[in-house]
Interface confidence: medium
Amino acid sequence: DAHKSEVAHRFKDLGEENFKALVLIAFAQYLQQCPFEDHVKLVNEVTEFAKTCVADESAENCDKSLHTLFGDKLCTVATLRETYGEMADCCAKQEPERNECFLQHKDDNPNLPRLVRPEVDVMCTAFHDNEETFLKKYLYEIARRHPYFYAPELLFFAKRYKAAFTECCQAADKAACLLPKLDELRDEGKASSAKQRLKCASLQKFGERAFKAWAVARLSQRFPKAEFAEVSKLVTDLTKVHTECCHGDLLECADDRADLAKYICENQDSISSKLKECCEKPLLEKSHCIAEVENDEMPADLPSLAADFVESKDVCKNYAEAKDVFLGMFLYEYARRHPDYSVVLLLRLAKTYETTLEKCCAAADPHECYAKVFDEFKPLVEEPQNLIKQNCELFEQLGEYKFQNALLVRYTKKVPQVSTPTLVEVSRNLGKVGSKCCKHPEAKRMPCAEDYLSVVLNQLCVLHEKTPVSDRVTKCCTESLVNRRPCFSALEVDETYVPKEFNAETFTFHADICTLSEKERQIKKQTALVELVKHKPKATKEQLKAVMDDFAAFVEKCCKADDKETCFAEEGKKLVAASQAALGL
């Protein structure tokens, strides 16, 4: 329904607090280098303007679109060209091209300093001195580092962040109370950002149809008692929400997400028996809870899929009637029966079914042609099952750190052109699949593991897209969204790679490594491991293990020495020489 003033409409729907927070997130996700104070000023100006439109929707400029209003505001930033270079050219364009231009300049890996956590007392003082500014700063810092973070979900994180400080800054042991909560929020936040990044990549690179197919499969697994019409309605609404958020339309997105949560709760009897607790919560918690809700139990008496999708003489007629609807029904019926499959596997099966019908419905005897289509599914199902079994066995044998190292070696050999920081980050995340998923029983392993790997490999794809260096990565990332993981799994050692020149500086370490956290120390060692493989791609596991064991012993020895820096200098030279000899460099 049309509103005279879109900005007034959203202000009234969302309320001032959420409106301001969402505008801040939107601006920080677009202009990632701008100082906090500049963004706060812009947000306050937009908010004051919105209030004038609420008072009188016919007031000047109140009828303008949100893109026009926000784009005009962003283009008033004085240092736009100095700070952002060619992004300033966006301001010469008209809507909707201007917004598209801003979207294209979002940077998944902005050159921003790492967020360093101050002392607990310092944080608590800042929180008490000015709670509003403290929380706005949190939104700003997360949004600019994660330009596709799901905005309504970031409001939920901010609410939890505030609750943590409110509780812990009064506690006897502030640090013991606060630090685990902040660690949890950080880890959950990174995971949430990566999941949303995949949704946006799916929409932007593969289109609405790809996203809708993903949503049909996931919602059918989650709500197996819901009818196809119900699932289709939810998919349509969910697609709208994510299209808006991925497109920078954060006010509309948050508003529509709230409407969707309301609809789901009002109709939970025909959706899922698991929603009751979620629906008793306040809005932000409710939406989060619904998004994470466990799968409902499958109806007991579901008939065989073969009857309608293979044995029926009407299969080709049904398919011809409305291809996407029929394929959607196939995906719905298959997914609700298989909560034990990953979404990407279900999508591969649907694609195989579609390809078979395309071929067979044009054949002389269609039924004879597609009669064995379900047999084609067997190898597709077994491939991820076997891969997960092997990797979980390896994880249980090695533990997380060494499992990550095995993946670091594996992926560096596959795509050695990729930057070392990216290989370390992606392989570490790939390695976390072990502790995340291998603990689950068989029926939950595949959806956990393969869908998580899709999220992590998308990180590789978006980081690589910024500075493409490997045709193999580009190929796996762009050919098929659902076959990304099998594509990377199938890559062997890149025989065309010319080993990197040896540089002793890369393997020179200093006493500062001793004061690093365990995680940071691991990253240093894993960075060295990637560099080793880049120098010697044909090194055996045994050779690499020997060098890494020596390296660990060297760090441990020098960190215990009285004169640490001298130890690192002298022992480091010996280690480099010994490593070169061991690897034949």
Epitope: D308, A322, F326
Partner: nanobody, 124 residues
């Protein structure tokens, strides 16, 4: 929820005509199948014919082919069963049913929602 209400049943002579209506209300969907079934005294419920809402394509059971016609009125959300040359063996309670999706559905299990039914009696 989708609600279905049949109307138009009654008592007619063999050879006469009758038009049944099925009005649908509730959540709309991009693609629906509307089917007509009937249950004669002491018999199983059997498929009569169906229509794909989006395309208007229809299909029938052999015994009514050429005599019965299904049509739809999108604006009124109503499906019609036009029955000509009625026979005593057409006597039954007639039900309309609906399924979300597409398909030339002929089986009860394929349909989600059902009307209460309307009685058709054909006397000789």
């Amino acid at each position: 929820e989708v609600q279905l209400v049949e109307s138009g049943g009654g008592l007619v002579q063999a050879g006469d005509s009758l038009r049944l209506s099925c009005a649908a209300s509730g959540r709309p969907f991009m693609s629906y199948v509307m089917g007509w079934f009937r249950r004669a005294p002491g018999k199983e419920r059997e498929f009569v014919g169906g229509i794909n809402w989006g395309s208007g394509n229809t299909w029938y059971t052999d015994s009514v082919l050429g005599r019965f016609t299904i049509s739809r009125d999108n604006a009124k959300n109503t499906v019609y069963l036009q029955m000509n040359s009625l026979k005593p063996e057409d006597t039954a309670v007639y039900y309309c049913a609906t399924a979300a999706g597409v398909g030339y559905y002929r089986y009860e299990r394929q349909y989600d929602y059902w009307g209460q039914g309307t009685q058709v009696t054909v006397s000789s």
